[in-house]
Interface confidence: medium
């Protein structure tokens, strides 16, 4: 592997022995936190003693990515210090490549290789020694660092228990082949959250799915509290560069997030794309389709790549509650192409949530059966009722004299004009399916500035007279 | 929006130096690099070495190492150049702009300041 | 060091026209190419980053395309603002190197 990296790199002098001097192995052990000089180095057991490293614990290794300040940033002691309060007999060890990762980036890239290697030198040296298992060794990478993990895994003598990408770096390793970026290869379980993917500018995290399963909170775009406003309060000094710091380091946070609130975990929905999980397609549990994220991601026997989603709050705890909503739509004449707002109120046993709009990613399909997901950011409990909502929009002259008109023909029924029978809830949390009904059966129809309320009839999704899951009442 | 305000042309001896500075405004000035570039008359673009403010890193082209020192000053949020023992080589025009981190391109650019080396 | 050259030192072309310029790069850049505008009061603009990305503010007639080792700008409907000098630069290593422009001029 080393002569097969020697060849991959532009200069010599940024071959194995500049990287020995450039990359440091800090540990950090729960039981010394303060003891800022533990480095382990190759070929020397004293430092292992010295700082009480655990042969038979879980061993975790930071690897920090890119950076433009030449100094650790706030997020990798946050890291250290979850790992720590989660897994308290564990080693953390911190990969500190600054001298390298301080460049350009493109240089820093060029470096990635080396350290990788030098890593995997450490993990060999390691396995050396009574009761080490490379099965307990878990790499952690951001950005940059997460493809450091990947040729770690790639050069080390066995194969690495994991290895979690949070928001791999996106340039100059998009659509690459395996051997020159982080893949499901790498380890046994390779996981992966996406924070900053960007089908303009410049992908700052790689889009292309590269472990097991990835994960794109929120799309793997836009991620909510990181907007220009969100950032610092003010547009004038909201930069760019501020947004792009917030959102490609999300994917730590969400980490941290899925260490220390155990309590409240997030779980991702398999989806083959983003639009369909906003559609709210996508919230099925069967067959290993959704998972935890970060830290409580769990080894499924999927085979590679498979994409999951989920929505997030914009800070910690991230968890939220994740509904699908199916509604008919009956129309019973033609209406043209509508597009309406509708909003919905969701009671439970427990609270009521704020009111949510149900995103039209498409269009409404009028006499059909349309989907929506809804997410709260509280414990709603069991649900009780649902309020929807039609929002009235403001009308032209046009649109008054024709409605007035349609009136004067029709007069029973306004021209803009809905029937909802009743809707159907999936909680992604719970998989629990519920059926809410009209109160009042010959009530049923909506128009824009109305609301029909909806309350629970029964458990599940068939109704007693149904026959076939196909059948619309 | 983002300006870089460089200091007015300068007429100097040979053998002798000179500081260019390069006002920053409408950004926060230590997240981002500023570079120099150099433009001789009716020539191209030769980049000269980066001073990146947040951490006082910098960056030279092996060719500027002994001709070029960067320095700043934060709280006048001012980047500045000395060229030393100036030659006639070193008549030109020098930009300083802002470097767009992953890109590499520099987005900004100041209005340059014009050297002239002559006895 | 990368050497960047841009073959073509001048350019005449007639409002209207479609233009292309040139720019090829001594080793491969992985797409690390950007395109800048030098105004003839010396004004310095960017235009394209990272060989395709148009810049904010930047018209829309401007494009950019290539990989590898070469790469181009095109300016699709050529405007008399348009006329100004064009330099290519790499971004994928350092030190930092441009191409020699291009002087584009109306026919």
């Known amino acids: 592997a080393e002569e097969q990296l020697e060849g991959g790199l532009r200069t010599a002098k940024d071959g194995p022995a500049a990287a020995k001097a450039a990359v440091r192995f800090h540990l950090r052990t729960s039981k010394g936190p303060e003891r800022e000089g533990c480095y382990l180095s190759v070929g020397h057991s004293q430092p292992l003693e010295d700082c009480s490293f655990n042969m038979t614990a879980k061993t975790f290794f930071i690897i920090h990515g890119w950076t433009m300040s030449g100094m650790l940033e706030n997020w990798l002691h946050k890291l250290v210090s979850a790992l720590q309060m989660r897994e308290k007999d564990a080693n953390v060890v911190v990969v500190d490549w600054l001298p390298l990762a301080h460049q350009l980036y493109t240089d820093a890239v060029n470096s990635t290789r080396v350290v990788g290697l030098s890593v995997a030198k450490m993990l060999d040296w390691l396995q050396g020694k009574d009761g080490f298992s490379l099965g307990n060794v878990h790499l952690i990478g951001y950005s940059l660092g997460a493809h450091v993990a990947g040729f770690a895994g790639n050069f080390v003598k066995g194969t690495v228990g994991r290895i979690t990408g949070l928001d791999p770096a996106g340039p100059m390793f998009e659509g690459v082949d395996i051997h020159r970026r982080l893949s499901p290869d790498d380890a046994d379980f390779v996981d992966v959250l996406h924070t900053y993917t960007r089908s303009f500018g410049i992908s700052i995290g790689i889009q292309m799915p590269v472990g097991h399963i990835d994960i794109y909170p929120n799309g793997g775009d836009f991620q909510p509290g990181c907007g220009l406003n969100d950032v610092l309060g003010s547009i004038a000094y909201g930069t760019i560069a501020e947004v792009v710091k917030c959102e490609h380091e999300r994917a730590v946070h969400l980490f941290v997030d899925s260490l220390v609130n155990q309590d409240k975990p997030s779980f991702a929905f398999q989806c083959t794309d983003s639009n369909r999980f906003k559609k709210g397609i996508c919230l099925s549990c069967r067959k290993n389709r959704c998972n935890g994220i970060g830290y409580n991601a769990k080894k499924t026997r999927n085979k590679r790549n498979t994409k999951m989603y989920l929505k997030t709050r914009a800070g910690m705890p991230f968890r939220v509650y994740h509904y699908q909503m199916k509604i008919h739509f009956f129309s019973y004449k033609s209406v043209g192409a509508i597009e309406p707002t509708f909003y919905v109120t969701l009671y439970g046993t427990n609270a009521e949530s704020q009111v949510l709009s149900l995103e039209i990613v498409e269009q409404i399909g009028l006499n059909a059966t349309n989907t929506f997901l809804v997410y709260t950011e509280e414990d709603l409990g069991d649900l009780l009722k649902i309020k929807l909502t039609w929002e009235g929009t403001s009308r032209s002259w046009y649109d008054l004299w024709r409605e007035f008109r349609s009136y004067l023909s029709q007069p029973h029924r306004p021209e803009r004009e809905l029937s909802i029978r009743r809707i159907r809830v999936k909680s992604g949390e719970t998989q629990r399916r519920l059926t809410f009904c009209v109160e009042d059966p010959e009530k049923t129809s909506i128009a824009p500035g109305q609301e029909l309320w909806f309350y629970k009839c029964r458990d599940g999704w068939r109704m007693k007279n149904e026959t076939s899951p196909t059948v619309e009442l | 929006q983002v300006q870089l305000q460089q200091s007015g042309a300068e007429l100097v001896k040979p053998g002798a130096s000179v500081r260019l500075s390069c006002k920053a405004s409408g950004y926060t000035f230590t997240k981002y690099t500023i570079h120099w570039v150099k433009q001789r008359s009716g020539q191209g673009l030769e980049w000269i070495g980066w001073?990146?403010?947040?951490?006082?890193?910098?960056k030279y082209n092996e060719k500027f190492k002994d001709k070029a020192t960067l320095t700043a000053d934060k709280s006048s949020r001012t980047v500045y150049m000395e060229l030393s023992r100036l030659t006639s080589e070193d008549s030109a025009v020098y930009f300083c702009a802002r470097h767009e981190e992953y890109t590499n391109s520099l987005a900004y650019w100041g209005q340059g300041t014009l050297v002239t080396v002559s006895a | 060091d990368i050497q960047m050259t841009q073959t073509t030192s001048s350019l005449s072309a007639s409002l209207g026209d479609r233009v292309t310029i040139s720019c090829r790069a001594s080793q491969d850049i992985s797409n690390y190419l950007n395109w800048y505008q030098q105004q003839p009061d010396g004004t310095v603009k960017l235009l394209i980053y990272?060989?395709?990305r148009l810049h904010s503010g930047v018209p829309s007639r401007f494009s950019g395309s290539g990989s590898g080792t070469d790469y181009s700008l095109t300016i699709s409907n050529l405007e008399q603002e348009d006329i100004a000098t064009y330099f290519c630069q790499q971004g994928y290593t350092l030190p930092w190197t441009f191409g020699g422009g291009t002087n584009l001029e109306i026919k």
């Open positions: 990272y060989t395709s």
């Open positions: 001073f990146y403010p947040g951490s006082d890193s910098i």
